[in-house]
């Protein structure tokens, strides 16, 4: 029986050109997290595997950084980044938990969760 719940940042907005941290949190279960997938609609952004570490999809490599923790940081946001993002937690023995975040990228200055990482 799956007892866990996923908490996400929910609906968030950020400024065009800015940064955002996407975070999900799995609670209320003792299941071991074996992998977390981050997806944008049907497109894979990144995988965080407990044994293999991070894999960032090549098309996002220059503006995505892993972390903090199992989260994901998106940089240099464009209006095209507006949409649904999913964190998919693969766990043992529970199975799969999915969380949803809706990101709206705005032209105005309504940025949240500004990230501190830099990619030269």
């Amino acid at each position: 029986m799956m007892t866990g719940t996923i908490e996400t940042t929910g609906n968030i907005s950020a400024e065009k050109g800015g940064s955002i941290i996407l975070q999900c949190h799995l609670s209320s279960t003792t299941a071991q997290v074996t992998q977390v997938n981050w997806e944008q609609q049907d497109q894979l952004l990144a995988i965080c595997n407990a044994d293999l570490g991070w894999h960032i999809s090549p098309s996002f490599k220059d503006r995505v950084a892993p972390g903090p923790g199992l989260g994901l940081t998106l940089q240099s946001l464009t209006v095209n980044d507006t949409g649904e993002y999913f964190c998919i937690y693969h766990t043992y023995p529970d199975g799969t938990y999915t969380g949803r975040i809706f990101l709206e990228v705005l032209e105005s200055s309504v940025a949240e969760h500004g990230a501190r990482f830099q990619i030269p």
């Epitope: 799995l26 609670s27 965080c48 293999l52 570490g53 991070w54 894999h55 923790g69």
Partner: antibody
Amino acid sequence: EVQLQQSGTVLARPGASVKMFCKASGYSFTSYWMHWVKQRPGQGLEWIGAFYPGNSATNYNQKFKGKAKLTAVTSASTAYMELSSLTNEDSAVYYCSREGGYGMDHWGQGASVTVSS
Amino acid sequence: DIVLTQSPATLSVTPGDSVSLSCRASQSIRNNLHWYQQKSHESPRLLIKYASQSISGIPSRFSGSGSGTDFTLSINSVETEDFGMYFCQQSNSWPYTFGGGTKLEIN
């Protein structure tokens, strides 16, 4: 087997700079953050910053911005930390550790830096 | 920055005792809390990840609990090899931070 091999002991003068290394083996170097942690004698652990070799992303503790510079040579699976304008307060053991999202699961043996005139 | 406060600073116990070490965060960090053990003149070692998840190779007498701001590392029947320093660390937000540590010593 995952291993993080760090530089040896360094003795430096106040005002000088030192660059230490952390050579990784046994895993995909570009898939993990490399963290650097400071420990003064008899004290706790202090997070300096981290470098992600996958795309050269960095994150610093504000306290160490301007003091520590983190870099890496991916082809050599080696991370570096340069400490500048050394003072007695920089005398410590410095650890590198890797993190792939699930805690810092492997640590180097530590590199000792002593600043003395 | 998130401040992690560990208590007690020192804990004197007898082998065979069961103990609890506390780590309190200055704001909610959900379950993004990890525990490390450091023996004298050694590097830290990861004991527990994400507040309660076990680590391969770590004895089952070590367990973790908590969420939000209050976390506990429990050692069921302390053995002599368990004496040393214990640190908590958060990965909820940058910059990562460590607690000040709890020293577990022989009574």
